[in-house]
């Protein structure tokens, strides 16, 4: 505040992402994700932190399992409120297969196109949420390299729920999901004990995404 009591400068809270980013969230929608509303709660908490609009952050959502569905494109909605309503309505598509490479590749090739709302010169961010080793992991290395070549920043989230439910080792799965994340891995990879715990990483994930434009 100046001597004449005018506001000279102010610092905005670091809670909202008001920068320009094109974010595509790639959701595993296979049956083993349970309960599904933990995923929609996670989406809600993450998206409400974003300043969404054609000149701010844009968000698209892709769901995969046995195949891939574009739930909505980057340019489909022009406000946070609209995106929140749409995200809440996303239903689980189901299926037994977890085609993670296909989901990521489809997001890269289709979701991040100008036809679907991607903007030239705007940083591309992909958030991948999955709960199991991919059935197409032989393709994963190439798919990740293709994302790298296109400068797509990747955050990956491993949900350990189905492994914990079956008392299975998570080691191989965690390694796979870590390999999806951008470097440095410790800033781009998250794991949660089960689906209910997804909401606990929203703050940290949000901060790391928003930091990309800092």
């Amino acid at each position: 505040v100046s001597p004449t009591f005018q506001v000279v400068n102010s610092i905005a809270p670091v809670q909202e992402c008001s920068t320009q980013l094109d974010i595509v969230i790639v959701l595993d929608g296979s049956n083993s994700i349970y309960p599904w509303d933990s995923v929609t709660a996670f989406l809600n908490d993450l998206l409400e932190r974003m300043d969404i609009g054609p000149k701010q952050t844009q968000v698209g959502i892709v769901q995969y399992g046995e195949n891939v569905t574009h739930e909505f494109n980057l340019n489909k909605y022009s406000s946070t409120e609209e995106v929140l309503v749409a995200a809440k309505k996303i239903v689980q598509r189901g299926g037994r297969q977890t085609m993670t490479a296909l989901g990521i590749d489809t997001a890269r090739k289709e979701a991040f196109t100008e036809a679907r709302g991607a903007r030239r010169g705007v940083k591309k961010v992909m958030v991948i949420v999955t709960d199991g080793e991919s059935h197409d992991n032989h393709r994963l290395k190439k798919v990740i390299q293709d994302c790298e070549d296109e400068n797509i920043q990747r955050f990956s989230i491993a949900i350990l729920g189905s492994y914990n439910r079956g008392n299975l080792s998570t080691e191989k799965f965690v390694e796979e999901i870590k390999s999806i994340a951008s470097e440095p891995t410790e800033k781009h990879f998250f794991n949660v004990s089960d689906e209910l715990a997804l909401v606990t990483i929203v703050k940290a994930l949000g901060e790391r995404i928003f930091a990309l434009e800092a």
């Epitope: 049956n31 309960p35 399992g65 046995e66 299926g95 037994r96 299975l168």
Partner: antibody
Amino acid sequence: EVQLVQSGAEVKKPGESLRISCKGSGYSVTSYWIGWVRQMPGKGLEWMGIIYPGDSDTRYSPSFQGQVTISADKSISTAYLQWSSLKASDTAMYYCARLQGDCSGGTCYGHFDYWGQGTLVTVS
Amino acid sequence: EIVLTQSPGTLSLSPGERATLSCRASQSVSSSYLAWYQQKPAQAPRLLIYVASRRATGIPDRFSGSGSGTDFTLTISRLEPEDFAVYYCQQYGTSSWTFGQGTTVEIK
């Protein structure tokens, strides 16, 4: 709109065979498990077994293993429950229900979110 | 297998009253994987609650579930005429599904 439509009521004699059906619509039927539940007259609910129509993987409750056969035809989005030789004690209402959850890797979990209207089977 | 015991067997209440239904498991239900269903005469069961406390789509907020481990409760805060029915709990944490024997909520 998710719907499970079951075949009509059946009246059979002991020893006869029977197959009842459950047709799903309004969702990807091959991507969700379908369970069968029995309700004997004036009694509670009993889980019988479950099938994944996409590849016909099937699990049975120990109480019903060998007593019934669960199958599916994914081309027509239909699950079936059948008996080769009915008994009077098979008289009951039979429901199919969609599982929101999974039954892979030896671990089954989830709730039944949509139910068929039921098929009454009378054996006498 | 886990045995679920519901109490009371019958609950006689008037519309507007609060109903509290209990479901006790013979062993701990993993991850609070317990659901509640409502069944009216000549109708199929209808999902009310899953994962112990989450309301299913379209279920009024007068229905609430609570509990963990071996003790679970379904509460109907103010009974409406359409709430008089049989209520079943169901566990699904053991690669098998078992139901309680049911609690009948009848008009007093």
